[in-house]
Interface confidence: low
C-alpha cells in the first residue's frame, strides 16, 4: 500500500530535493530556505531566488523549509526541575535537561521531569543512574527496597510485599511474639 501523502508533500515531491513547488504556479520550483531562515516571498520565476529572511530572536527553523513563520523557541519547564543546556539559536531550539545526578522521568513524549538519582544507601548500585532511568539498587541483607530506597527489615509489616525479602527477620519476630502462647 502506498501511504497517503498530504497536499504539501505531494506538491514538494514534484520538485527535486531542496526545492518546493510554487503555490500559485505549479510549473515553477523554488529553492527552499536554509535552516535559521523562513519564507518571506516565493521565487518570482524559474532560476530566481526565493526571498528568505532570518528568524527573529526567540524563534528558529532547524531544517531547510518553506515555512511562512519561524517556530517559537521552547522554554524549559522550571516547575519540572528542567535546566537550560543550550539556548535557542535561529537554527536550533532550546535544549533542556536535568542537573547532574538527576534523571528524566517522561510524563509524555515531550514532557519530562527531573528527579534525583537514588543513592542506594544500605545497598549497592545494580544499574547506574542514566539520562532517562533512575539507579537500580540492590539492598544489603536485612534491608528491602521501598520507593527505591533500602529500608530496614524492622520496618517491614507482615501485610507488605517485603515479608518475602525479610523472611528470616519476620520469622524471628513471630517466634518471639508466639513464645509462651498456645
Amino acid at each position: 500500500l502506498v501511504p497517503h501523502l498530504g497536499d504539501r508533500e505531494k506538491r514538494d515531491s514534484v520538485c527535486p530535493q531542496g526545492k518546493y513547488i510554487h503555490p500559485q504556479n505549479n510549473s515553477i520550483c523554488c529553492t527552499k530556505c536554509h535552516k535559521g531562515t523562513y519564507l518571506y516571498n516565493d521565487c518570482p520565476g524559474p532560476g530566481q531566488d526565493t526571498d528568505c529572511r532570518e528568524c527573529e530572536s526567540g524563534s528558529f527553523t532547524a531544517s531547510e523549509n518553506h515555512l511562512r513563520h519561524c517556530l517559537s523557541c521552547s522554554k524549559c519547564r522550571k516547575e519540572m526541575g528542567q535546566v537550560e543546556i543550550s539556548s535557542c539559536t535561529v537554527d536550533r531550539d532550546t535544549v533542556c535537561g536535568c542537573r547532574k545526578n538527576q534523571y528524566r522521568h517522561y510524563w509524555s513524549e515531550n514532557l519530562f521531569q527531573c528527579f534525583n538519582c537514588s543513592l542506594c544507601l544500605n545497598g549497592t548500585v545494580h544499574l547506574s543512574c542514566q539520562e532517562k532511568q533512575n539507579t537500580v539498587c540492590t539492598c544489603h541483607a536485612g534491608f528491602f527496597l521501598r520507593e527505591n530506597e533500602c529500608v530496614s527489615c524492622s520496618n517491614c509489616k507482615k501485610s507488605l510485599e517485603c515479608t518475602k525479602l525479610c523472611l528470616p527477620q519476620i520469622e524471628n519476630v513471630k517466634g518471639t511474639e508466639d513464645s509462651g502462647t498456645t
Epitope: 516547575e79 521531569q113 528527579f115 534525583n116 538519582c117 537514588s118 533512575n134 520507593e147 527505591n148 530506597e149
Partner: nanobody, 119 residues
Framework: EVQLLESGGGLVQPGGSLRLSCAAS????????MGWVRQAPGKGLEWVSQ????????YYAHSVKGRFTISRDNSKNTLYLQMNSLRAEDTAVYYC????????????WGQGTLVTVSS
C-alpha cells in the same frame, strides 16, 4: 497507613464543570506537595497539575492551563481539582498522589475517580 481517597468524578457534558476532591490520611499532609495525574482509556499516565505543600506554587500541564485549578485545604487534609470548560479529551481516570520529588515521581496513589465528558 497512607490513604488517598478521590471523589467527585462522573459524567458531564462538554463545556461543563466538575470538582474532584482527594481526602488524605496516614501522613503529615502539610509537609508534601500533591499532584493530580490522569489516564485516558488505552493511554499512558499524563501529569495534570501540582501544588506545593504551602499552596503558594501551582503548576499545570499546557493541555489544562486556564481551565483547571488545583487547590488544597491543609486544615482538612484535602486536595481539590476544579475542572471547567471540560472537553471530550479530558475523559480519564484521575488520580491524586503524594509528590515527594525524592527519587520517583509519586510514592503513593489513590484508587482514582473516573471523569467522562460526553454529550
Amino acid at each position: 497507613e497512607v490513604q488517598l481517597l478521590e471523589s467527585g468524578g462522573g459524567l458531564v457534558q462538554p463545556g461543563g464543570s466538575l470538582r474532584l476532591s482527594c481526602a488524605a490520611s496516614g501522613f503529615t499532609f502539610v509537609k508534601y506537595s500533591m499532584g493530580w495525574v490522569r489516564q485516558a482509556p488505552g493511554k499512558g499516565l499524563e501529569w495534570v497539575s501540582q501544588i506545593s505543600n504551602t499552596a503558594d506554587r501551582t503548576y499545570y500541564a499546557h493541555s489544562v492551563k486556564g481551565r483547571f485549578t488545583i487547590s488544597r485545604d491543609n486544615s482538612k487534609n484535602t486536595l481539590y481539582l476544579q475542572m471547567n470548560s471540560l472537553r471530550a479529551e479530558d475523559t480519564a481516570v484521575y488520580y491524586c498522589a503524594i509528590y515527594t520529588g525524592r527519587w520517583e515521581p509519586f510514592n503513593y496513589w489513590g484508587q482514582g475517580t473516573l471523569v467522562t465528558v460526553s454529550s
